[in-house]
Interface confidence: medium
């Protein structure tokens, strides 16, 4: 195209520009160490520093790690981009109670409105369900029959966690940072009896008070409501529930409005030093030699030839049924099969033992 010649000529002799035949334009040549933000940069501002994968260019022009959404209660809302961090939010059915930069530090299940209350605003990733008193007759605001049911006689209605199917947690959001504990806590939440009281299911009809029964107008039959992870002690004070966050502990009973969470040693360990609602020191059962982990085969275009998956060290076994391949009836707290991309395996924290299943996938081994 002769008419393009003049444009091409304007680039010649100008070291800061080059001619791009594809777009038939003169383009600005990004200086060494800078990367074009578009196919044919026109000016210096169209060039930027390039970061490694999973890093973004922050305001100070530094490559900074994008946040991870690897906890099992988080999902990726927006991906890690060249100039902005990945953003995580609580997974469906949960809301954020403690926010963090580009993420959420603590997610809780949406409350289910108790009997006599109906959903005013459904829960979102940021906000819990908002309930309001049911008007006489069936209200169109009833999001589901569950939210409008009257209690059977003799029962005390309580907010209860929305049952969430374990299937909603995808492979990419399985526990990483929390490891065993998160998997077990999640499993305990998911398998909890629907009517058991829980710290994670509270109505938000009133920020300060929560009815032990639907609070009749003018009645004093309302109790003080504590923050998530706190319970109302005998003195009427909000007291922190114990934490089962140590890797050798699992949650035995959840944090309820009037009682602390209780922790016990994870399977394969026994309590050597007890503590209120918990165990101060767990010790392993007597152990025997472990089998060798076999090396997973190359499975994808990215290289997978490392010696073993990033799963901590294969533990010594203990001669109990929990070890190795779990029986078909094993509960989610004992064995969690992590299904991951072929070339990317999920890490387990330093004290979480693992085994490899016959498929080469890591299995959390509570033994």
């Amino acid at each position: 195209f002769p008419q393009d010649r003049p444009f091409e000529d304007t680039c010649h002799g100008n070291p800061s520009h080059y001619y791009d035949k594809a777009v038939r334009r003169c383009c600005y040549r990004c200086p060494m160490g800078l990367f074009p933000t578009q196919q044919c940069p026109q000016r210096p501002t169209d060039c930027r520093k390039q970061c490694e994968p999973d890093y973004y260019l922050d305001e100070a022009d530094r490559c900074t790690a994008c946040v991870t959404c690897s906890r099992d209660d988080l999902v990726e809302k927006t991906p890690c981009a060249w100039n902005s961090s990945r953003v995580c939010e609580c997974r469906p059915g949960m809301f954020c109670s403690t926010s963090a930069v580009n993420s959420c530090a603590r997610c809780f299940f949406h409350s289910v409105c108790p009997a006599g209350m109906i959903v005013k605003f459904p829960g979102t990733a940021q906000k819990n369900t908002v309930c309001e008193p049911a008007s006489p007759g069936v209200s169109p605001a009833c999001a589901s029959p569950e939210n409008c049911k009257e209690p059977s006689s003799g029962t005390i209605p309580q907010a209860k966690p929305t049952p969430v199917s374990p299937a909603t947690s995808s492979a990419s959001t399985m526990p990483v940072r929390g490891g065993t504990r998160l998997a077990q806590e999640a499993a305990s939440k998911l398998t909890r009896a629907p009517d058991s009281p829980s710290s994670v299911g509270r109505p938000s009809s009133d920020p300060g008070l929560s009815p032990t029964q639907p609070c009749p107008e003018g009645s004093g039959d309302c109790r003080k409501q504590c923050e998530p992870d706190y319970y109302l002690d005998e003195a009427g004070r909000c007291t922190a529930c114990v934490s089962c966050s140590r890797d050798d502990l699992v949650e035995k009973t959840p944090c309820a409005w009037n009682s602390s969470r209780t922790c016990e040693c994870r399977p394969g360990m026994i309590c050597a030093t007890s503590a209120t609602n918990s165990c101060a020191r767990c010790v392993p059962y007597p152990i025997c030699a472990a089998e060798t982990v076999t090396k997973p085969q190359d499975m994808a275009e990215k290289d997978t030839t490392f010696e073993a998956p990033p799963l901590g060290t294969q533990p010594d076994c203990n001669p109990t049924p929990e070890n190795g391949e779990a029986p078909a009836s094993t509960s989610p707290t004992q064995s969690l099969l992590v299904d991951s991309q072929a070339s990317k395996t999920l890490p387990i924290p330093t004290s979480a033992p693992v085994a490899l299943s016959s498929t080469g996938k890591p299995v959390l081994d509570a033994g």
Epitope: D54, V67, P310
Partner: antibody, heavy 123, light 106 residues
Framework: QVQLQQSGAELARPGASVKMSCKAS????????IHWVRQRPGHDLEWIGY????????DYNQNFKGKTTLTADKSSNTAYMQLNSLTSEDSAVYYC????????????????WGQGTTVTVSS | DIVMTQSPKFMSTSVGDRVTVTCKAS??????VAWFQQKPGQSPKVLIY???YRYSGVPDRFTGSGSGTDFTLTISNVQSEDLAEYFC?????????FGGGTKLEI
């Protein structure tokens, strides 16, 4: 398995240049960036920079800009680092390293290291 | 740049002991910290990544903990082969930076 094989020790005069190599094997060379780290006796390990063998893009620690040049040759699966205008301060062991491919995230902690190239600058 | 201050510089211990090495970051680095072991005349080897995850093949006597600015590497039941220098590294923000190292003498 993944291996990074570095070239042998270098003895150089002040003001001279040296070019050391890091030959990668056991994985697809263009999939991972190669990083360089300096270790001087009595000093912290220092990150020098990295090269993306696929694009040729390199990024440097500000302290090493002008001192080092990173290049890569895809045909031989080899990364190179040239040190210019050598002084006694540049006497050190230089390592090439590669990040792991672990978890769902690609953060830069080094699972694989070369054996190191010792550079001695002496008149 | 983020400064990683590691302590102690030297540590003398006996086989079977438990030792703790600490690393303090000059600013919040989340859990983007790795720990390395370097034996005399060898290259560094990764022990821990993401502050608390043990790399494959690393004995379980090595544990990592911490987040934000304070990080700890603990070696329980020290063995003679643990004679080495230990380094922390932050990979939260470029330039990547390392701690000054802790020499473990047995």
């Amino acid at each position: 398995q993944v291996q990074l094989q570095q070239s042998g020790a270098e003895l150089a005069r002040p003001g001279a240049s040296v070019k050391m190599s890091c030959k990668a094997s056991g994985y697809t060379f263009t999939t991972y960036t190669i990083h360089w780290v300096r270790q001087r006796p009595g000093h912290d390990l220092e990150w020098i920079g990295y090269i993306n063998p696929s694009s040729g893009y390199s990024d440097y620690n500000q302290n090493f800009k002008g001192k080092t040049t990173l290049t890569a040759d895809k045909s031989s699966n080899t990364a190179y680092m040239q040190l210019n205008s050598l002084t006694s301060e540049d006497s050190a062991v230089y390592y090439c390293a590669r990040r792991a491919d672990y978890g769902n995230y690609e953060y830069t902690w080094f699972a694989y290291w070369g054996q190191g190239t010792t550079v001695t600058v002496s008149s | 740049d983020i400064v990683m201050t590691q302590s102690p510089k030297f540590m003398s211990t006996s086989v079977g002991d438990r030792v703790t090495v600490t690393c303090k970051a000059s600013q919040n680095v989340g859990t983007n910290v790795a720990w390395f072991q370097q034996k005399p005349g060898q290259s560094p080897k990764v022990l821990i990544y993401s502050a608390s995850y043990r790399y494959s093949g690393v004995p379980d006597r090595f544990t990592g903990s911490g987040s934000g600015t304070d990080f700890t590497l603990t070696i329980s039941n020290v063995q003679s082969e643990d004679l080495a220098e230990y380094f922390c590294q932050q990979y939260h923000t470029y330039p990547l930076t390392f701690g000054g190292g802790t020499k473990l003498e047995i």
